[in-house]
C-alpha cells in the first residue's frame, strides 16, 4: 500500500493530527523534499551572520558573514574575523606575519616564502608580509649579452625585519 504521506510536496508536511493530509509549512519553517512528516525551522542569520538567501517554504535560509568577517565550515556554520593581508588571526587577535612568511589574503595563516634555491633558481623579487618571493631563472640560464629583466617589488620594500 502506498504511503499517503508520499503525496505531500515540498513546502508541506504530512499532518498526523489531521488524518495524514498535507498541511502547508507555517511561516519560518520549510520542507525541501516531499513526504516529510514535519517542517524544519528556518535558520536565523543573526549577530555576525547576515542573510544571503531568505527562507521559503521549500528551502532554508542561507547565511554569510557581515563585513570584516568570513565564513568557515559547511554552509557557513561559523564566522571568523578578517585580518589584513600580511597578518594572521591568533588567539590574541590579528598579528603581522613573521619575517620569512606571508599571507596574501584576509583569512588563513602566514606561510613561508618559497625557497627558490630548492629548485635551483634565484630570487627575482624579494618576499614581503603580503607577497611570496618571485623566483627567477637560475644564474646559469642567462646567456652572455642577454639583459636580465627586473620586476617591480609588490608592496614597495624588498623585505622587512622580523618582529
Amino acid at each position: 500500500l502506498q504511503d499517503p504521506c508520499s503525496n505531500c510536496p515540498a513546502g508541506t508536511f504530512c499532518d498526523n493530527n489531521r488524518n495524514q493530509i498535507c498541511s502547508p509549512c507555517p511561516p519560518n519553517s520549510f520542507s525541501s523534499a516531499g513526504g516529510q512528516r514535519t517542517c524544519d525551522i528556518c535558520r536565523q542569520c543573526k549577530g555576525v551572520f547576515r542573510t544571503r538567501k531568505e527562507c521559503s517554504s521549500t528551502s532554508n535560509a542561507e547565511c554569510d558573514c557581515t563585513p570584516g568577517f568570513h565564513c568557515l565550515g559547511a554552509g557557513c556554520s561559523m564566522c571568523e574575523q578578517d585580518c589584513k593581508q600580511g597578518q594572521e588571526l591568533t588567539k590574541k587577535g590579528c598579528k603581522d606575519c613573521c619575517f620569512g612568511t606571508f599571507n596574501d589574503q584576509k583569512r588563513g595563516i602566514c606561510r613561508p616564502w618559497t625557497n627558490c634555491s630548492l629548485d635551483g633558481k634565484s630570487v627575482l623579487v624579494n618576499g614581503t608580509k603580503e607577497r611570496d618571493v618571485v623566483c627567477g631563472p637560475s644564474p646559469t640560464d642567462f646567456s652572455p649579452g642577454t639583459p636580465s629583466t627586473t620586476m617591480p617589488v609588490p608592496g614597495g620594500e624588498p623585505g622587512h625585519t622580523s618582529h
Epitope: G11, T12, P24, C25, P27, N28, C42, E54, C55, S56, S57, T58
Partner: antibody, heavy 117, light 112 residues
Framework: QSVEESGGRLVTPGTPLTLTCTVS????????MIWVRQAPGKGLEWIGV?????YISHATWVKGRFTISKTSTTVGLEITSPTTEDTATYFC??????????????WGQGTLVTVSS | DIVMTQTPASVEAAVGGTVTIKCQAS??????LAWYQQKPGQPPKLLIY???TLASGVSSRFKGSGSGTEFTLTISDLESADAATYYC??????????????FGGGTEVVVK
C-alpha cells in the same frame, strides 16, 4: 504580469461579500499574495496573506471578520459580516519572491466596497 | 503584534529641499522594512525594500536607512511629483506574534 481585484459593490450590513483577486502571467504556487484595505482618507491596513504553499495568515485584529481562500489563478477575500467600518478600497498585491519575509511589488488598482443601510 | 509608528503625519517642503520620514517598529525587525509611495486614486508603489535597497526604476533621490527598530526615508532634491503619502511596512514574517506585514500610519508630503 498583472493583478486585478473585483467584486466590490454596495452591500447592506451583515450581508457576506466575496472579493476576488485574479492574477495572470505568473503562478500563485510561486508567490505570496496579500490583501490590504484603505478606508476613505485613511491609511493602509494589512488584512492577511496567503503564501505560495497555501499557508494563510490573518492580521490579529481580523478575528474571523475576513476569510482568505486560494485557487490556481485567484485569491479570494470574504467579508463575513460587513459593517460600515469595512467601507474601503480593497487591494490585492503580489510578493516579489517566494520567501517568508517578502515584500510586495505588484499591486492591483483596488476594488471599492461600500457598506451602508 | 508588531506596531509601526510613523512620524511626522504630514510634512511640507519646497521644491529642491529634503524631507525625512521616520518609522519605528515596536520590536526588532532587522532590516525587514519596505517603503511605499501612494498618490490619490492609485495603489501603493514600492520604493525601497530591505530597509535600504532601491526598487527597480526608483530615483536615487529616495534613500532608506536603519535597522532593528528605527528606520528613515529621506527624499532629497524634492520634485513636485514627490507629493504623495509615504508608508513604511514591515515584512518580518516570523515575529513572535506572526503578524508581520503591518503598515505605518503614513506621512503626507506636501511640496510647495
Amino acid at each position: 504580469q498583472s493583478v486585478e481585484e473585483s467584486g466590490g459593490r454596495l452591500v447592506t450590513p451583515g450581508t457576506p461579500l466575496t472579493l476576488t483577486c485574479t492574477v495572470s502571467g505568473f503562478s500563485l504556487s510561486t508567490y505570496a499574495m496579500i490583501w490590504v484595505r484603505q478606508a476613505p482618507g485613511k491609511g493602509l491596513e494589512w488584512i492577511g496573506v496567503v503564501y505560495d504553499n497555501g499557508y494563510i495568515s490573518h492580521a490579529t485584529w481580523v478575528k474571523g471578520r475576513f476569510t482568505i481562500s486560494k485557487t490556481s489563478t485567484t485569491v479570494g477575500l470574504e467579508i463575513t459580516s460587513p459593517t460600515t467600518e469595512d467601507t474601503a478600497t480593497y487591494f490585492c498585491a503580489r510578493s516579489a519572491d517566494g520567501s517568508w519575509s517578502t515584500y510586495f511589488n505588484l499591486w492591483g488598482q483596488g476594488t471599492l466596497v461600500t457598506v451602508s443601510s | 503584534d508588531i506596531v509601526m509608528t510613523q512620524t511626522p503625519a504630514s510634512v511640507e517642503a519646497a521644491v529642491g529641499g529634503t524631507v525625512t520620514i521616520k518609522c519605528q517598529a515596536s520590536e526588532s525587525i532587522s532590516n525587514y522594512l519596505a517603503w511605499y509611495q501612494q498618490k490619490p486614486g492609485q495603489p501603493p508603489k514600492l520604493l525601497i525594500y530591505k530597509a535600504s535597497t532601491l526598487a527597480s526604476g526608483v530615483s536615487s533621490r529616495f534613500k532608506g536607512s536603519g535597522s532593528g527598530t528605527e528606520f528613515t526615508l529621506t527624499i532629497s532634491d524634492l520634485e513636485s511629483a514627490d507629493a504623495a503619502t509615504y508608508y513604511c511596512q514591515t515584512n518580518y514574517c516570523c515575529s513572535s506574534s506572526d503578524n508581520g506585514f503591518a503598515f505605518g500610519g503614513g506621512t503626507e508630503v506636501v511640496v510647495k
